[in-house]
Each structure stands twice: as C-alpha cells, then as structure tokens.
Amino acid sequence: MMTGTIETTGNISAEKGGSIILQCHLSSTTAQVTQVAWEQQDQLLAICNADLGWHISPSFKDRVAPGPGLGLTLQSLTVNDTGEYFCIYHTYPDGTYTGRIFLEVLESSVAEHGARFQIP
C-alpha cells in the first residue's frame, strides 16, 4: 500500500532571465527512494540515481543545475519554460510517486521570485 505523499513548491512564478528552484519532498513512507527523475511535460530534464548520481539531459546542461538536495535549479529562464514540471520518485517497495509543479515565467518584474522551498 502506498502511504507516502509528495509535497511540492506548487504553482510558482519567476522572471525571464532569472532562476528558480523546483523542489519536491516525499514523506509519510519508509519506502526507500532509488531514483528521482525530473520531467517537463514529456521531456526528461534530469535524473538523480542512487548508484550513478546526477545525470542532466544534454539539451538542458547549460541551464539546469542539480540540487539543492533532490531538487532542480532552472537558470536563464525564458517564457518557453512556462509549463508543468514533474518530480517522479521511484521507491522500494511502494513504487512510483509523482509530484506536479506549475511554473510561469513572466516578462515583467511583477513576478514573485521563487524562494528555496522550506518546510515550516
């Protein structure tokens, strides 16, 4: 039975040219995480694997940085980065947990800058 829950940064916005941290946390389960994948729509951005560590997709290498933790930092944001992002936790024995974040990249300085995700 899958008892875990994924907490995410939810809906966030950031300015064009800036950077943002995407963060998910899996809790309420003692399942062990073996891999965390980050996807934008159907495109793989990055994987953090228990054995191999981080792998950033070649097409995103210049603009994606691993961390903090199992999160992902997106840099040099463009309006085209607006959209859904998914963190996919592969765990044993529970299986797969998925969290969703919606990022809106704004042209103006009206955007709220995404701060590092913190649990109170």
Partner: antibody, heavy 119, light 113 residues
Framework: EVQLVESGGGLVKPGGSLKLSCAAS????????MSWVRQTPEKRLEWVAY????????YYPDTVKGRFTISRDNAKNTLYLQMSSLKSEDTAIYYC????????????WGQGTTLTVSS | DIVMSQSPSSLAVSVGEKVTMTCKSS????????????LAWYQQKPGQSPKLLIY???TRESGVPDRFTGSGSGTDFTLTISSVKAEDLAVYYC?????????FGGGTKLEIK
C-alpha cells in the same frame, strides 16, 4: 576534510533526558542525510535515527520511537538527538554518521560520545 | 526486521594469509529494478569509529586497499582480504540498507597470530 564531532554524552538516571550534538565540518552539511548509530557495551551496532537533508523526513526503529527525536540546524551545521525516558539498554557510544542522498549506508562516522544510563 | 548474521564471530590468521568472512541476511537485499544489493561492510579498529569499506555489496570505497573485496548477492555475502596485514586487526561489520530499520551484523573480529 570531513569531520563529525559528537558531544553531550554523560551519566543519566533511568527515566532521564539528554541531548546529543554533532558538529559537522569539511563538507556541505545541508546536502547530506544524517543518522545516529549507537554501539552497545557488547559492541553491537544499532541504527537509532535518520533525518533527510532538509530535515523534512525523520525515521526511527521501534526501540526508540516516541522517546528519541532527531533534528538538524543546517545554518549551524549541527545534528541533534534529543533522548527522553532513557533506559539502561540505551547505554552506548552514540555516533553521528553521514549518508549520501539516495544511498543509505554511512560513509563517514564521528568519534562518538558515551551515554551511560544507570541509577 | 531484516536479521543480519555474521560468521565466524572471530578468527585469528597470520600476516599474508587470505581471510574470508560471511554475512547472511534473513531477506534478499537485491533490488530487482537496479540490480543492486543494498549491503555495506565496515571496519572498526580498536578505539576507533567504524569506517566504510564496501557498499552495494562489492563497490570499494575510495581509498580502501584493493586487498579488500566484497562479493555475493541476495542473502549471502562475503568479505575477503586477499593478504592480511597487521593493520587489518579490527572488527568487521555488515549492514543492510535495503529497508527500515537498517540493521547490522554482530561483527567478525579479526585477530593477528
């Protein structure tokens, strides 16, 4: 150089409380999961508490659940273990140990601090 | 809980000899999706804290001499020291990190004749 230095051990009466600390240096503390592992007088090793890198997840074995609380202050690079309702079987050397994200073995250990629970 | 059993509990060998110690788990430590065995070996010298030797059952930690070799899969694991040195005097522990609570074997004490 990775360093983990435990402190706070001592002699406590059964039912008493104590808080252990572990000062970390030589690495990015907030990028690592951490645990406390104890070694009994019989030299057996027992894992007693785990905390994730950002502090959002904590796990304990049944032997200490409800009595021990692990916490961390990433700004101070310090790990803590608050122990209450102590029993004689909690007597041990307590080590803090570092864990790489997604890898649950202990890649660095401190030198340990000794807790003795006795009346 | 997964029970880890080590044997022998102690052994005495001469410098230069080959040593083999075993660790058995009550459940398989092999995770099928990544084909990794979630088992580690530690060395604890007298008066010191434990030191990581081997993880994923067979991967040597950086800086560990190549005379130390981990092998095995599933429930049966072995730590081999190909040619013992006097400095290898220690207790060797296995640990499973496959599932909570993480558990250790009782240790194998290596003494030098």
């Amino acid at each position: 150089e990775v360093q983990l230095v435990e402190s706070g051990g001592g002699l406590v009466k059964p039912g008493g409380s104590l808080k252990l600390s572990c000062a970390a240096s030589g690495f990015a503390f907030s990028d690592y999961d951490m645990s406390w592992v104890r070694q009994t007088p019989e030299k057996r090793l027992e894992w007693v508490a785990y905390i994730s890198d950002g502090g959002y997840n904590t796990y304990y074995p049944d032997t200490v659940k409800g009595r021990f609380t692990i916490s961390r202050d990433n700004a101070k690079n310090t790990l803590y273990l608050q122990m209450s309702s102590l029993k004689s079987e909690d007597t041990a050397i307590y080590y803090c140990a570092r864990q790489i994200l997604l890898r649950y073995y202990f890649d660095y250990w401190g030198q340990g601090t000794t807790l003795t629970v006795s009346s | 809980d997964i029970v880890m059993s080590q044997s022998p509990s102690s052994l005495a060998v001469s410098v230069g000899e080959k040593v083999t110690m075993t660790c058995k788990s009550s459940q398989s430590l092999l995770y099928s999706s990544n084909q990794k065995n979630y088992l580690a070996w530690y060395q604890q010298k007298p008066g010191q804290s434990p030191k990581l030797l081997i993880y994923w059952a067979s991967t040597r930690e950086s800086g560990v001499p190549d005379r130390f070799t981990g092998s095995g899969s599933g429930t049966d694991f072995t730590l081999t020291i190909s040619s013992v040195k006097a400095e290898d005097l220690a207790v060797y522990y296995c640990q499973q990190y496959h599932s909570y609570p993480w558990t250790f074997g009782g240790g194998t004490k290596l003494e030098i004749k």
